[in-house]
Amino acid sequence: SETTTGTSSNSSQSTSNSGLAPNPTNATTKAAG
């Protein structure tokens, strides 16, 4: 079956199976070090 891995937010396909948000937000803090 067709996967929708990491599909773009511009596409009608779902990104859910990729495990990555369609347009991830920038983290608001820096890790120490």
Partner: antibody, heavy 115, light 112 residues
Framework: EVKLEESGGGLVQPGGSMKLSCFVS????????MNWVRQSPEKGLEWVAQ??????????RYVESVRGRFIISRDDSKSSVSLQMNNLRTEDTGIYYC??????WGQGTTLTVSS | DVVMTQTPLALSVIIGQPASISCKSS???????????LNWLLQRPGQSPKRLIY???NLDSGVPDRFTGSGSGTDFTLKIGRVEAEDLGVYYC?????????FGGGTKLEIK
């Protein structure tokens, strides 16, 4: 069957360059964001770079430590993604995996940066 | 960057017994679409990582239902109902909500 096969690792001196490639089969490559992730004993698993789709104008993202030194690119006609690594540092040493999202991973290729 | 903290670092379990791994994130992983992009991976010795769970609790195809994922916001848990020999390896959580994507340090599951 989904396959992601990396190539191009090896030994390189600090300041040198190396290009990694990954060939993909088993899913629609042109519809998939592609990523490079590396693994080292010191840093564990670390996401390195991402390239999005043609419809996104092949937008790219990089982790801060490689920005300006690494360039990710893709060739949808060949279902391949590459990582051009320049001005390499010893801390870039590790196993480099190409992945599609978090779901599919290649077997990895080892880069050693050492004098 | 979002820091992913896994505990314990190592776990030694008798076959047939349960196991539990915790993953805590320094920021909420709830995305604006209402989904939470928290994944669990297993890296068996000498192999590349393999995903077990995505979106906190969804099992990948072929993953046994003895694995369950739960949690929300910043606190997540992977549970193995009854550990089997094939479960040994290092388990990682990884978040895909915030850029850059970040991984936990790993939990090594050993068989007693």
């Amino acid at each position: 069957e989904v396959k992601l096969e990396e190539s191009g690792g090896g030994l390189v001196q600090p300041g040198g360059s190396m290009k990694l490639s990954c060939f993909v089969s088993g899913f629609t490559f042109s519809n998939s964001w592609m990523n490079w992730v590396r693994q080292s004993p010191e840093k564990g698993l670390e996401w390195v770079a991402q390239i999005q789709l043609k419809s996104d104008n092949y937008a790219t993202r990089y982790v801060e430590s490689v920005r300006g030194r690494f360039i990710i690119s893709r060739d949808d006609s060949k279902s391949s993604v590459s990582l051009q690594m320049n001005n390499l540092r010893t801390e870039d040493t590790g196993i480099y995996y190409c992945s599609s999202g978090t779901d599919y991973w290649g077997q990895g290729t080892t880069l050693t940066v050492s004098s | 960057d979002v820091v992913m903290t896994q505990t314990p670092l190592a776990l030694s379990v008798i076959i047939g017994q349960p196991a539990s791994i915790s993953c805590k994130s320094s920021q909420s992983l709830l995305f604006s679409n209402g989904k939470t992009y928290l994944n669990w991976l297993l890296q068996r010795p000498g192999q590349s990582p393999k995903r077990l769970i995505y979106l906190v609790s969804n099992l990948d195809s072929g993953v046994p239902d003895r694995f369950t994922g739960s949690g929300s916001g910043t606190d997540f848990t992977l549970k193995i109902g009854r550990v089997e020999a094939e479960d040994l390896g290092v388990y990682y959580c990884v978040q895909g909500t915030h850029f850059p994507y970040t991984f936990g340090g790993g939990t090594k599951l050993e068989i007693k």
